[in-house]
Amino acid sequence: MAVTACQGLGFVVSLIGIAGIIAATCMDQWSTQDLYNNPVTAVFNYQGLWRSCVRESSGFTECRGYFTLLGLPAMLQAVRALMIVGIVLGAIGLLVSIFALKCIRIGSMEDSAKANMTLTSGIMFIVSGLCAIAGVSVFANMLVTNFWMSTANMYTGMGGMVQTVQTRYTFGAALFVGWVAGGLTLIGGVMMCIACRGLAPEETNYKAVSYHASGHSVAYKPGGFKASTGFGSNTKNKKIYDGGARTEDEVQSYPSKHDYV
């Protein structure tokens, strides 16, 4: 039950995260005009990954796409690439995780297959989240660098005597959406990976009979050791009980989410 909940929650969190990454990638407000030096501007500039926009005093907003690939800064191209890779990986991860969900039955799919798929989607979500966080962080770093550069050259002479203030840009809403969405996708991926360990199937469990030797509290169990599944090998040689004869210490021996550490 706990495994299903962890897997389901991981899926939902990742879904929200990927939706956020898509939203952030499409948003126009990656950078917005810094109003500190010109709070009374009637013309407000903001830029996204795909186009730049200007809101005028009339309330009219005009956006113009970046109709060039070669003329764009390499960093912007890198951010675009990271966000797209994040979306693609996230989308594939979502597709895989839908089939991996424990609550969904597809034919006679083995638990081991579901476990593998859960792990795969989890890793995809983690990489997707990291791509988004990296993309947003690279863009933020680019903004900070440009901000201080333009502050240093705040006043550029125009026509000799007249001074014109250079437009500076600061963090836009899309950056915060991207950071949060990337984080959620990452958390969702980790949850999927955790859930995967609980989905790992056990080999045939024989009904165990406990034999009590006088003066000893050792329970003998033929074939009672958990076989390694590849997902969190059983290094502790825990005994598996399957409702057979019970010992006094069996109360603490039921398999639980803590058994797969």
Partner: antibody, heavy 115, light 113 residues
């Protein structure tokens, strides 16, 4: 076509208030800011401020800020300009304007302040 | 506040001749975000509201005859009427559309010589 129709002329006493309306039609009222401009007799144009019907935001010329209130009613696509504590130098034609580059203007409302 | 200074205050030009009105702003009206200058030109005839002629310093509004043209950048702008017509007699205003409060020039009265 885009139209801005303003309320009729007003005669007020000093110290009173006046509320001028501007009814918009032919465009999405919430998409553009409605600006108000004052023109005293034989004088030039003076920007008073704007109201953004979409979000209720506004911006005022500091010269008028303490006496002017700009509001809008999106249900009837109408913007209002209320000027309080009227003085004789408030006698002027008041225009509402909207659109890119103030492409559309109301016909103007003459407010006369006289004792 | 940005101060808009128009010159001359009045201008008399013969029909068919070129008329030039200048406008100077105390600060640049150039927006680096889209490389445009935020200056507007209006024409106002007696008893009428102003009529938009030019926005963004050089973009003619729809329906405005092509004899009207705007030019300039930064702080210096010009409205040119290439061939004056009788119906062009009016007062012309320039306006800062870049920074609040939006400010207007004092106006230039254009007459026929």
């Amino acid at each position: 076509q885009v139209q801005l129709v303003q309320s009729g002329a007003e005669v007020k006493k000093p110290g009173a208030s006046v509320k001028v309306s501007c009814k918009a039609s032919g465009f999405t009222f919430t998409s553009y800011n409605i600006h108000w401009v004052k023109q005293a007799p034989g004088q030039g144009l003076e920007w008073m401020g704007y109201i953004s019907p979409g979000n209720g935001g506004s911006n005022y010329n500091l010269k008028f800020k303490d006496r002017v209130t700009l509001t809008s009613d999106t249900s009837i696509s109408t913007a209002y300009m209320e000027l309080s504590r009227l003085r004789s130098d408030d006698t002027a034609v008041y225009y509402c304007a909207t659109g890119r580059g103030f492409a559309y203007w109301g016909q103007g409302t003459l407010v006369t302040v006289s004792s | 506040d940005i101060v808009m200074t128009q010159s001359p205050d009045s201008l008399a030009v013969s029909l068919g001749e070129r008329a030039t009105i200048n406008c100077k702003s105390s600060q640049s009206l150039f927006n680096s975000g889209n490389q445009k200058n935020y200056l507007i030109w209006y024409q106002q005839k007696p008893g009428q509201p102003p009529k938009l002629l030019i926005y963004r310093a050089s973009t003619r509004d729809s329906g405005v005859p092509d004899r009207f043209s705007g030019s300039g950048s930064g702080t210096d702008f010009t409205l040119t009427i290439s061939s004056l017509q009788a119906e062009d007699v009016a007062v012309y205003y320039c306006q800062n559309d870049y920074s609040y409060p939006l400010t207007f020039g004092g106006g230039t009265k254009l007459e026929i010589k």
